[in-house]
Amino acid sequence: FERTRSLQDPCSNCPAGTFCDNNRNQICSPCPPNSFSSAGGQRTCDICRQCKGVFRTRKECSSTSNAECDCTPGFHCLGAGCSMCEQDCKQGQELTKKGCKDCCFGTFNDQKRGICRPWTNCSLDGKSVLVNGTKERDVVCGPSPADLSPGASSVTPPAPAREPGHSPQ
């Protein structure tokens, strides 16, 4: 099928970075400046994304791949391919429609994005509170109260590695 298609359609021979130019007898022409084609056989090149304003360029556009944007300091990416930049807040705060607000007592946010969340209720999971929560940190739950018999060694919580929201999609 592929061989038949290429015999019938000269455009299928045009590689990425070019387009099949109908105005020039279906010759493969290079993509004009600020445009790209990431696959072969395309009849047009796509306009490169421009990273402006709060967006900054993470990867320049080439003839075969689109530009990639991220956000300027003080903002973080949201959406597929960083389609939006949202304002950072401090840990211990959440971004509301009126700006950054401190977490209420009993809630925390250990990120620069997202909401303030209630502290974990250790007793609901049959455990006891080992370390109290703050605006910036959830409580740390330890062994169940029954396990805390005299002579039992206390548990040192491991240092957090990467929290939700800090890993690539």
Epitope: R113, D138, A161, P164, G165, Q169
Partner: antibody
Amino acid sequence: QMQLVQSGAEVKKPGASVKVSCKASGYSFSGYYMHWVRQAPGQGLEWMGWVNPMSGGTNYAQKFQGRVTITRDTSASTAYMELSSLRSEDTAVYYCAREGMAMRLELDKWGQGTLVT
Amino acid sequence: SYELTQPPSVSVAPGKTARITCGGNNIGSKSVHWYQQKPGQAPVLVIYYDSDRPSGIPERFSGSNSGNTATLTISRVEAGDEADYYCQVWDSSSVVFGGGTQLTVL
């Protein structure tokens, strides 16, 4: 490709417990909160709770507190939901759902569901 | 506890615009997410943070939120849009879903 695959259907007697698993693949399991939502036959969606896969921290809907336990095994990239003291009204499809990058409780990827009868 | 009210059903002719509402006290101050659920399938996020669209969701889907009402708008409705639609918010310590709206394409 990112997906959440849940364990198979279960039939339980009243008073028993059920434990449903949700295996994540195609993304960093520890980086995203995992939620559980259920749907009784012909009814709407009902949120049960979440787990932070990094810390194990949880939050449960008041309705289920004392009956539900949500845990995770980071080495297996799997979240679990255990519901105890089952009654007929607990017959439902149980879904796990990943919270998105905005971390505003938007559930951007769902498992296929597990029917518990 | 916080309550979200949706109309049980909405009917629309193909090619027309469907509007599904979600009512709640001062809902405009909250972030609203919308899900589409087709029979026998898991829900799919179609709008988040009031009006943002996940990748893969057509531009025909849009959202707005102010006062006491959030609205999901589906323009140029197609037969494939027939489904149940749920709104969702976060209120203090709980995720709350609306009762759902069945969209029928006539």
